[in-house]
């Protein structure tokens, strides 16, 4: 606790102080005061540097004095035989004695009391930037008129901030202009405009004299001007060394005026206005501007358009034009947005065919859709090249938008059929002879592939059995090859409504009609050993004459086994319908009249023994088409006959190519569509 | 279900003639082949023949080609085995079987019909 | 006539040992790449029924244990492992060539 005053006296004074010792006393006295420390007795054994005995005043970190040996009072009238003043309000003293003390020595006596500092004086940095008064215990700082005291209590400025500008023009001036400015001062002015508009500042170059740089530069006075995040200046110096347009980009702006003690100028004064905020004419490329100007400024709308083949995309939602305000913050709203190159995207896969990974799928690029050669054509033209459209789609010139269909090849088998001789009396044939044969299971018949969804064969085959298992691509049916080949699932049956349904059907004489189509619920992918044949065209052109050849092919009995296990063929030739009634029928089921021979039979045969048998109805007579000698048309189905190894009679197909069209069509998927 | 039924057993005198017989359900036997096997007791498996249902074509083995006479009814989907001269050589049983999908062997058999010859 | 021969008539093998049954034709029965050759089984009071056809084809709802294997004249039936319900006599018979013929046969019996 600070005290006024104190004694201070050593160890048993008076009488003699005892060996090593070591002892001190922390002096406080009230703030803003000094101490006055002074020594009435003194009796300290003496030495050199007082090393042995001593006492040491101490203020701070500074050895105010250190005493040993004896004093005695030079002034009669006063007592003090040694004094120390600190203008600080602290003090230590330390008494040190050694081991041994030659004589008796008794000590010191010594008093302080606190004593008044003048801080106006006292000390080299002035307490005040103006005027000091000082005062017992303290000191106060006053200033000059028209100055205040700032809230350190002792620095003086003018009182030259606070002003807020909100006015689209004005001017300010530095304080006293043109008089000189206050010293030791910080003036702050603000100027805040409505968004949209930026502060503009003007000055002249003579309108500006402010103390100028020191040796290294740097500015004694200085004016600043802070918009936002940008600065200009600090400026000093006689007449404005900065642009004397400053264009802030902002519409806030503070103006800083800092001064420091001495060296007084005229100071400034500058003018400001308030712009519009201007939007830089941004170059969009692949746009067009709407209106186009010279200069935009804040409320500025604008519609920005693509040109053909661009487009704005923001979120999945692609635009040709969009709308741009100037900002109050001398932005463009929507800046992010451009006009891409419009992009068509990955195209669209197609059945059956492809399209090689375009480089770029964007506007103007092309693709070319190829469909899987030699098994599939495109059916719908337009030669498979398609550009990137400006409306995003891929577009070709025949077909529009419409994606190429690859539909497959009819009546082109892989590799010839070359007769070797065994069918009755045929040949061993390839599966890649007659891609388009179709196995049967149950009952053992065959049947023609004339497209991915459907399956042609004779009516007696399916009338049995509605759900058959059919099988393609396979020259042997023995099971282990059928498990590799490739299983058709049938969806429906549809036998010609002209094909009479028997109670007993064994005891049949009448095949008139005996044709079917099996529709598939998957489609058929086509390949070197699957391929469809093709149907006989409406004209005239497929009027079969007697002697035109037609294939025949299937696992039927031949002259050595019940069921061959792989493929057999012949070649035989047409023959008249009278040659087919002549032959007698092997096991008559009624009366050899009973038989019905009927327009749409043709009878083909005849020739070194060769037919059709059991285990083949169902397959097709394939006839060289008349118009293109590459391709085979199915002329007739393997319908029924007198006896194996003669004649034997076929479905005429010709006569059902409406009725095979409409079913199709009417049961058709949109995936066929 | 392709199932094949075989006529009852039969007792018959040496020198006389049996007919027996095989109905075939789930199929029609026009669009198979109907084959016939012997058994004699405690003895192996015989292959008498086949026909064709379709238009009567046969094939027998040449031991059996004057001992039987393989028919069939389509109309009926019933095919029949006519052994004839018996003698107590033929006592055995008589089976019926057909390739349903398969193409030469037999998937689908007769349960068989026991012919005894004695005096 | 193509004979076939099963040189075994009888044949004793332990529960779940391997059984081998062989059968040999007197002249190939191969035709266009496959093998006319098929294995019965034959049960007291039964009909036969097919296990293999064309030589190593498994007739559907027979076990995986049963398999056949060989080409031209020579043809083997294997059973493994070998369960109780296979005690029958098993039957070799072509198809290639008229008429047909079956093997003698061989009785399997479990030990």
């Known amino acids: 606790e600070p005290t006024m005053y104190g004694e201070i006296l050593s160890p048993n004074y008076p009488q003699a102080y005892p060996s090593e010792v070591e002892k001190s006393w922390d002096i406080e006295v009230p703030e803003g005061y000094g101490i006055h420390l002074y020594f009435t007795h003194l009796d300290i054994e003496l030495s050199e540097n007082c090393a042995y005995d001593s006492v040491q005043i101490i203020s701070g970190d500074t050895e105010e004095g250190r005493l040993c040996g004896q004093r005695s009072s030079n002034n009669p009238h006063s007592p003090i035989v040694e004094e120390f003043q600190v203008p600080y309000n602290k003090l230590q003293v330390i008494f040190k004695s050694d081991f041994s003390n030659e004589e008796r020595f008794t000590g010191f006596a010594a008093y302080y009391v606190a004593t008044d500092i003048n801080e106006c004086t006292d000390f080299v940095d002035v307490p005040c930037s103006h005027f000091c008064n000082n005062f017992i215990g303290g000191y106060f700082c006053s200033c000059p008129p028209e100055y205040f005291l700032h809230d350190d209590m002792k620095n003086c400025g003018v009182n030259c901030s606070g002003d807020v500008f909100t006015a689209l023009i004005g001017e300010i001036a530095s304080p006293n202009y043109p008089k000189p400015y206050p010293e030791n001062s910080r003036c702050e002015y603000q100027i805040r405009l409505e968004k949209g508009f930026q502060v503009v500042v003007t000055l002249r170059r003579e309108d500006f004299d402010v103390e100028a740089a020191d040796s290294a530069g740097n500015c004694l006075d200085s004016l600043v001007f802070v918009a936002g995040d940008r600065q200009f200046g600090p400026y000093c110096g006689h007449g404005f060394p900065g642009p004397l347009n400053i264009e802030t980009k902002s519409n806030a702006l503070d103006i800083i005026f800092q001064t420091d003690l001495t060296g007084q100028k005229k100071g400034w004064k500058l003018r400001y206005h308030g712009d519009p905020m201007p939007c830089p004419k941004e170059d969009t490329p692949n746009s067009v501007w709407e209106p186009a100007k010279a200069k935009y400024v804040f409320r500025d709308v604008v519609q920005i358009t693509c040109l053909d083949g661009f487009e704005v995309v923001e979120g999945r939602v692609g635009a040709t034009s969009f709308y741009s305000t100037c900002q109050s913050n001398g932005k463009w709203s929507n800046s992010k947005l451009k006009c891409q190159p419009v992009d068509c995207g990955i195209p669209e896969s197609i059945e059956n065919g492809k399209v090689e990974d375009p480089e770029s799928t964007l506007f103007g690029s092309v693709i070319r859709y190829t469909c899987e050669e030699p098994y599939y054509y495109m059916e719908n033209g337009g030669g498979g090249e398609y550009h990137c459209a400006g409306n995003g789609s891929w577009v070709n010139e025949v077909l529009g938008p419409e994606l190429p269909k690859c539909v497959p090849v009819c009546g082109v088998p892989r590799e010839p059929f070359e007769e070797k001789q065994r069918i009755i009396g045929g040949s061993d044939a390839d599966i890649k002879n007659f891609p388009w044969q179709v196995f049967f299971d149950n009952p053992w018949a065959g049947g023609a592939l004339i497209n991915e969804y459907w399956v042609l064969t004779a009516a007696h085959v399916v009338e049995g059995n509605r759900e058959p298992t059919m099988y393609v691509g396979s020259t042997s049916v023995q099971t282990s090859r059928l498990a590799k080949s490739k299983m058709l699932t049938p969806e429906h049956v549809f036998i010609h409504p002209g094909w009479k349904l028997l109670e007993v059907p064994e005891g049949r004489t009448n095949f008139d009609n005996d044709i079917a189509l099996v529709r598939l619920k998957d489609p058929v992918k086509m390949g070197p050993t699957v391929s469809p044949i093709c149907l006989p065209g409406t004209s005239s052109d497929y009027n079969l004459m007697d002697g035109d050849l037609g294939l025949i092919s299937g696992w039927g009995r031949t002259e050595k086994r019940d069921r061959a296990v792989r493929l057999k063929a012949a070649r035989l030739p047409v023959a008249p319908l009278r040659k087919c009634k002549e032959v007698k029928v092997e096991k008559p089921t009624a009366d050899a009249e009973a038989y019905v021979f009927t327009p749409n039979m043709i009878c083909a045969g005849g020739e070194k023994g060769m037919d059709s048998c059991k285990g083949d109805s169902g397959g097709a007579f394939a006839v060289q088409d008349p118009n293109d000698k590459t391709k085979f048309y199915a002329a007739g189905l393997v319908s029924w006959g007198p006896q194996c190894g003669t004649y034997g009679l076929y479905t005429r197909v010709k006569n059902y190519v409406d009725w095979i069209m409409k079913t199709m069509q009417e049961n058709s998927t949109p995936r066929e569509d | 279900e392709v199932q094949l039924q075989q006529s009852g057993a039969e007792l018959v005198r040496p020198g006389a003639s049996v007919k027996l017989s095989c109905t075939a359900s789930?199929?029609?036997?026009?669009?198979?082949?109907i084959h016939w096997v012997k058994q004699r007791p405690e003895q192996g498996l015989e292959w008498i023949g086949r026909?064709?249902?379709?238009?009567?074509?046969?094939k027998y083995a040449p031991k059996f080609q004057d001992k039987a006479t393989m028919t069939a009814d389509t109309s009926s989907n019933t095919a029949c085995l006519q052994l004839n001269s018996l003698t107590s050589e033929d006592t055995a049983v008589y089976y019926c079987?057909?390739?349903?999908?398969?193409?030469?062997?037999?998937?689908?058999w007769g349960q068989g019909t026991l012919v005894s010859v004695s005096a | 006539d193509i004979v076939l021969t099963q040189s075994t008539d009888y044949l004793a093998v332990s529960l779940g040992q391997r059984a081998t049954i062989s059968c040999k034709a007197s002249?190939?029965?191969?035709?266009?790449?496959?093998?006319?050759m098929n294995w019965y089984q034959q049960k007291p009071g039964q009909p036969p029924k097919l296990l293999i056809y064309a030589a190593s084809n498994l007739e559907s709802g027979i076990p995986a244990r049963f398999s056949g294997s060989g080409s031209g004249t020579d043809f083997t039936l294997n059973i493994h492992p070998v369960e109780e319900e296979d005690a029958a006599t098993y039957y070799c018979?072509?198809?290639?060539?008229?008429?047909?013929?079956f093997g003698g046969g061989t009785k399997l019996e479990i030990k």
């Open positions: 026909i064709d249902p379709a238009d009567d074509h046969t």
């Open positions: 018979q072509q198809s290639n060539e008229d008429p047909w013929t």
């Open positions: 002249q190939s029965v191969d035709y266009d790449g496959d093998s006319y």
């Open positions: 079987a057909i390739y349903g999908s398969g193409w030469a062997w037999f998937p689908y």
């Open positions: 789930g199929f029609n036997i026009k669009d198979d082949y």
